[in-house]
Every structure is written in structure tokens, then in C-alpha cells.
């Protein structure tokens, strides 16, 4: 919908998790409500209670099975609906069909660390997350180094337009505390969006030898 | 941008049927949400049903549960309301309107609006 004050937004993990978003200016806050979930081509089906993250916000996680199990494929839809407690009965708010493979966000990277620290460089490596085997090699990364005296919004961002789980940052200062993370995107589409940013990995440059020029 | 053209509204008497239909066009036809809506004169515009485009599924207004009925032929991009049944009450513009992505949360907030088409029921 155009209009941003009500909207119904999902994205699926890839593996068994679909997030969803529900938005809505004016909505009753003590109203009980929750996400349906109904396969086209699936014997499931699956609910959660939708839960406040702000003041006309809420969101919940359809689990649809163990974290890494694959339970939906690229020719799935999965009807999704929004429905909230009227007296004794459940009234339908919103409604979409919602096409798993067109509308993916990964789990944030995970596990990284410091493979090896230098005075001016660092090679860091990762891992990604119940994605899925679909993907093969159709991911790209993007990451980013907190500097001293910076904030994360000004770190400029390095692309990896392949599955490349690791990185080599280059022209580093001497005995320096740094940030890193990374985040995930699948190729394939058309409303697909990054992942979360991974937890920060905190690390620091080896000092300049002693008499030498840095 | 998708456009919504209205057809098949008229004078019809009480108890009577009727058929209408709403030609869709653009580019993200194939993934939105096709919405029947009325206004009656002097009276806010209300929801009547909805249907998604890809698996058909359905959510009517009360007030039509049962008489009114929506469907969609994805080949000829076109979805329909069946009005059965009619009442006075029923006399209304009737608009077609679509969402596409991201959804609405909300059934009564649409992106696009068709010019509507009358429909009259005389007692």
C-alpha cells in the first residue's frame, strides 16, 4: 500500500521462520490479534500472537517447523492474514498472499572472528545462518568498520557480490580499537531485503614496531 | 501503476441479480489485492470484500456474507462481484480498488480506485 500508516509487511528466512509486521494507525491497543498462516500446497498451518513493538506497531514469528528444516519452496504461497478479537469472535484485517522466495531477509551473519590481526590490516570471517540450500552461491554481503570518533551510519559500506564469508580490511591505524559487521542478501526476489546487521565484532590493530616507519 | 475500469452496474428490482466486473490493468496486477467497495449517497465509502489475486482467497462485510460473492479470472484480468439478493440498502456506487505490495494492514486502505459503477435497487 502507498499509504505508510497501515501496512501488513512478511519476510521469510528461507529455512522455517516467517516475520511479520503489522501497522496500524488508530488501532485499538488492547486488542488481541495475530497472524494465520495457510499454504496453498501444505498440509500445515500456523499462528502467532502479534505482540506491541511501538505505539501502533506489532510483530510476531510464525515457526514453522526446526530452525534449519526447509518448509517452503520457491512455488509455494502462503495466505497470511491479520486477525483480531472482536467479543467472541475474529474479524479478518488485513489479508495477502505472500510469496516466500519474492519477500526474503536472512538471519544476520554469525560466529565472527578474527582469522588473523596485522598493524594496518585484519582478515575477518563469518557465517551465515539457516539460509537455505537454494541459494548455492546467490548471496552477496555487505560490511562495515566503526572507526574510533564514528558512528555506524557514517562507516562507508564494502560490497561482496559473491558468497564470500570472510574480508580482508586493509589501511587500518596501528593499535586501534575497531567494529565490524556484516550483513546477508539473497539474489533472488523481488521485495527481498538485507538481513539484520550481525552483533559488532570488536577487535585491535598490533601497535607499529618500535624504531620503525608506519 | 495499475488501472481499475468498472462495468455491468444498472436498475435492478428487489431480490434481483446482478453481476459486476472490474477490468485490471499495470504492471503488479499479479500480486495485489482486488477490493469491491460502495458508497450510498449521503454515506461513507465501505468495504464490501476483497480477494487476493494469486490464490483467491476471500474476506467479505458482514452485511454481504452469504449474497454477494467475489471471484477473479486471472486470464482475462478481471475480477467480479456477484450480487444476489438485492435490497434497497444495496443501492450504492460501486468501486474496484487494488493494493499492491507492501500490503495494507488495514482491508478499507487501497492504492488505486476505479470511477465506480451505480447500482440501483427499486423496491
Known amino acids: 500500500a502507498v499509504n505508510g500508516t497501515s501496512q501488513f509487511t512478511c519476510f521469510y528466512n528461507s529455512r522455517a521462520n516467517i516475520s511479520c509486521v503489522w501497522s496500524q494507525d488508530g488501532a485499538l491497543q488492547d486488542t488481541s490479534c495475530q497472524v494465520h498462516a495457510w499454504p496453498d500446497r501444505r498440509r500445515w498451518n500456523q499462528t502467532c500472537e502479534l505482540l506491541p513493538v511501538s505505539q501502533a506497531s506489532w510483530a510476531c514469528n510464525l515457526i514453522l517447523g526446526a530452525p534449519d528444516s526447509q518448509k517452503l519452496t520457491t512455488v509455494d504461497i502462503v495466505t497470511l492474514r491479520v486477525l483480531c478479537r472482536e467479543g467472541v469472535r475474529w474479524r479478518v484485517m488485513a489479508i495477502q498472499d505472500f510469496k516466500p522466495f519474492e519477500n526474503l531477509r536472512l538471519m544476520a551473519p554469525i560466529s565472527l572472528q578474527v582469522v588473523h590481526v596485522e598493524t594496518h590490516r585484519c582478515n575477518i570471517s563469518w557465517e551465515i545462518s539457516q539460509a537455505s540450500h537454494y541459494f548455492e552461491r546467490h548471496l552477496e554481503f555487505e560490511a562495515r568498520t566503526l572507526s574510533p570518533g564514528h558512528t555506524w551510519e557514517e562507516a562507508p559500506l564494502l560490497t561482496l557480490k559473491q558468497k564470500q564469508e570472510w574480508i580482508c580490511l586493509e589501511t587500518l591505524t596501528p593499535d586501534t580499537q575497531y567494529e565490524f559487521q556484516v550483513r546477508v542478501k539473497p539474489l533472488q526476489g523481488e521485495f527481498t531485503t538485507w538481513s539484520p546487521w550481525s552483533q559488532p565484532l570488536a577487535f585491535r590493530t598490533k601497535p607499529a614496531a618500535l624504531g620503525k616507519d608506519t | 501503476q495499475v488501472q481499475l475500469v468498472e462495468s455491468g452496474g444498472g436498475l435492478v428490482q428487489v431480490g434481483d441479480s446482478l453481476r459486476l466486473s472490474c477490468a485490471a490493468s499495470?504492471?503488479?496486477?499479479?500480486?495485489?489485492?482486488m477490493g469491491w467497495f460502495r458508497q450510498a449517497p449521503g454515506k461513507e465509502r465501505e468495504f464490501v470484500a476483497v480477494i487476493t489475486w494469486s490464490t483467491g482467497s476471500t474476506v467479505y462485510a458482514d452485511s454481504v456474507k452469504g449474497r454477494f460473492t467475489i471471484s477473479r479470472d486471472n486470464a482475462k484480468n478481471t475480477v467480479y462481484l456477484d450480487l444476489s439478493s438485492l435490497k434497497p440498502e444495496d443501492t450504492a456506487v460501486y468501486y474496484c480498488?487494488?493494493?499492491?505490495?507492501?500490503?495494507?494492514?488495514?482491508?478499507?486502505?487501497?492504492?488505486?480506485w476505479g470511477k465506480g459503477t451505480q447500482v440501483t435497487v427499486s423496491s
Open positions: 480498488a487494488a493494493d499492491v505490495y507492501p500490503y495494507s494492514g488495514n482491508l478499507n486502505i487501497m492504492d488505486y
Open positions: 499495470g504492471r503488479t496486477v499479479g500480486s495485489a489485492n
